[in-house]
């Protein structure tokens, strides 16, 4: 009181830190710095982040909180989960539909767009892995249904049609000639 | 728009008194800590006094230490610097500064001058 | 008490120059530096904060660097109207001091 030298900065507990003169507590998550401590060890003046805004750490510096990403329509992306005060939007894909990564080293934060997901039924196929984070993964043929090609080809269904090897084995029928 | 205006300056004898006022607006007073600094005719600045946001702590340059009083009146948004035994040295502008640190406002200064 | 020694006390240039001003502290600041600039009658207004943080509003041909002891303060291209005293400050301790100024002129 009344003397010169400023404090060491050894506040009891921990998140201090020295902004300016004085050692300050930070602001907690989803608050922004107003104005830092004015006496030692002191509290910062923190506010709480405006509607659409977020700081997801404590943090000694932030005098303003980050804006909230809008998720991308035009890349057919919806929120997962809404903005927060403490935690951005998370974007991502509606059910059905899979991230395809618009660069080639994907991490969290890089940008995306949503695909359909196959639909294995559409094309007679068994579903071997459900799609979420990539595409469907489909497996042999539904039952009644044979490979040719790149598809399923439904089994014939009476002796009239000709049946080719593969088909005999899955359909059940011998060539007819 | 961040206001500081100082009032209270004037011509004092040495040994004499004066009460400087530094009227705030603009801004939440009560959050900040306030200063003041002095610069003499053609001279340089001089940090003097620091009080905190509630007026709990105060600092003083020793060249002021004893003599001179700084105070805050939250309710009335108004920093108040009270000395007492001024002497010749003391003649300067007295500017009321917000911060804790890097001085981001200032008033416009008031003039005192010490002298027989 | 941390002394700030500021230099040079004066100089002069030209309208277009680059100019720096230095600053030494007695002891580490770390960067609890501040640049000020004053025009003649009027009160100080702070340019540069934390070394190197430019205030809001400020001209981006100002700016600061340093850390430490050593601080420079740089214009990057004299307008006419930087013609005023710069101050140099540091915030690391009590008692808050300040370099002596540099009194900017035109050529």
């Known amino acids: 009181q009344g003397g010169t030298r400023s404090p060491r900065c050894d506040c009891a507990g921990d998140f201090h830190k020295k902004i300016g003169l004085f050692c300050c507590r930070g602001c907690p998550a989803g608050h922004y710095l107003k104005a830092p401590c004015t006496e030692p060890c002191g509290n910062s003046t923190c506010l709480v982040c405006p509607q659409d805004t977020f700081l997801a750490w404590e943090n000694h510096h932030n005098s303003e909180c980050a804006r909230c990403q809008a998720c991308d329509e035009q890349a057919s992306q919806v929120a997962l989960e809404n903005c927060s005060a403490v935690a951005d939007t998370r974007c991502g894909c509606k059910p059905g539909w899979f991230v395809e990564c618009q660069v080639s080293q994907c991490v969290s934060s890089s940008p995306f767009y949503c695909q359909p997901c196959l639909d294995c039924g559409a094309l007679h196929r068994h579903t071997r892995l459900l799609c979420s984070r990539r595409d469907t993964d489909c497996g042999t043929c539904l039952p009644g249904f044979y490979e040719h090609g790149d598809g399923c080809v439904s089994c014939p269904t009476s002796t009239l049609g000709s049946c080719p090897e593969r088909c005999a084995a899955v359909c059940g029928w011998r060539q007819m000639f | 728009e961040v206001q500081l205006v100082e009032s209270g300056g004037g011509s004092v004898q040495p040994g004499g008194s004066l009460r400087l006022s530094c009227a705030a607006s603009g801004f939440t007073f009560s959050s900040y800590g306030m200063n003041w600094i002095r610069q003499a005719p053609g001279k340089g600045l001089e940090w003097i006094t620091y009080i905190s946001s509630s007026g709990g702590h105060t600092y003083y340059a020793d060249s002021v230490k004893g003599r001179f009083t700084i105070s805050r009146d939250n309710a009335k948004n108004s920093l108040y610097l009270q000395m007492n035994s001024l002497r010749a040295e003391d003649t300067a502008v007295y500017y009321c500064a917000r911060g804790q640190g890097p001085f981001e406002y200032w008033g416009q200064g008031t003039l005192v001058t010490v002298s027989s | 008490d941390i002394v700030m020694t500021q230099s040079p006390s004066s100089l002069s240039a030209s309208v277009g120059d680059r100019v720096t001003i230095t600053c030494q502290a007695s002891?580490?600041?770390?960067?609890?530096l501040s640049w000020y600039q004053q025009k003649p009658g009027k009160a100080p207004k702070l340019l540069i904060s934390d070394a190197s943080n430019l205030e809001t509003g400020v001209p981006s041909r100002f700016s600061g660097s340093g850390s430490g002891t050593d601080f420079t303060f740089t214009i990057s291209s004299l307008q006419p109207e930087d013609i005023a005293t710069y101050y140099c400050q540091q915030y690391d301790n009590l008692p808050i001091t300040f370099g002596q100024g540099t009194r900017l002129e035109i050529k």
């Open positions: 002891q580490d600041i770390s960067n609890y």
